[in-house]
């Protein structure tokens, strides 16, 4: 695996990159849970959505999230063909017209009602630094990941390669 400097170098260009197309290359519904198998749930409260990290009761249904995958434009030194591939970014939408959104000023993860084209704050680079788990890095702030803090989602700065495997930024995607 890359050290964090390598990862940041690899994704730094995303600051200036744009999304190749407005349409995603593919979309999948999945439930999102933490490394410790807590579920990410979404609740409508006072006309806005809240995001929770909680243990579900035995037969309680998991909330589904629509993951939309987009190709990013590459800097000219990367060909983006079948050999090198194209960087993929993901947006997460738990309900129609609402997307997870990185609020870098508040270090928070929020659900915002957006129209397409989506703002850069809605895009995340998907990482796989631990078996069966993924991490979501902010397009707008390389080195900053979605993580779990006090039973809520928050933005967490990762400053070393060891911390890329820290449990609070690891998530499991399940299509069942």
């Amino acid at each position: 695996a890359f050290g964090i400097s390598g990862v940041q170098k690899y994704t730094r260009a995303l600051h200036d990159s744009s999304i190749t197309g407005i349409s995603p290359i593919t979309e999948y519904l999945a439930s999102l849970s933490t490394y410790n198998d807590q579920s990410i749930t979404f609740a409508l409260e006072d006309e806005s959505y809240e995001i929770y990290v909680e243990d579900l009761k035995k037969d309680e249904k998991k909330d589904k999230v629509l993951l939309s995958y987009y190709e990013s434009q590459h800097p000219s030194n990367e060909s983006g063909d079948g050999v090198d591939g194209k960087m993929l970014m993901v947006t997460l939408s738990p309900t129609k017209d609402f997307w997870l959104h990185a609020n870098n000023k508040e270090h928070s993860v929020e659900l915002h009602k957006c129209e397409k084209p989506l703002p850069d704050q809605a895009f995340f680079v998907l990482h796989n630094m631990h078996s069966n788990c993924v991490s979501f890095e902010c397009k707008t702030d390389p080195g900053v990941f979605i993580g779990v803090k006090d039973n809520h989602l928050a933005l967490i700065k990762v400053d070393s390669s060891e911390n890329l495997c820290t449990e609070n930024i690891l998530f499991k995607l399940s299509e069942t």
């Epitope: 695996a1 690899y10 593919t26 190709e71 079948g82 050999v83 194209k86 993929l88 680079v125 796989n128």
Partner: nanobody, 123 residues
Amino acid sequence: QVQLVESGGGLVQPGGSLRLSCAASGSIFRINTMGWYRQAPGKQRELVASFTSGGSPNYADSVKGRFTISRDNAKNTVYLQMNSLRPEETAVYYCNAYIMAWSHGVLKGYDSWGQGTQVTVSS
């Protein structure tokens, strides 16, 4: 890196059958689309059969009812069962896939092609 490897080509008599296989390898997260193309000498590459991103099979009109595409998701493999083959179907058959795979821990998309397998239909 991701790789597609085809197998199953060969010489077959008109009216005969062949089964082609294409296996994808690498740090694969998901295979979005996967299918078969062919290129006869002096002609352009053309679609034979593929799976769309939604998972539905799609066939060229000329092969409908004779060719069947199938896949084994657990093995990241796609197959093409070709029956009632015709001499004009002599070509190099190529596997193509859009593969979402991990590269240095980051998810990337690859429009990948295999090296091709020769199918010759002749008596």
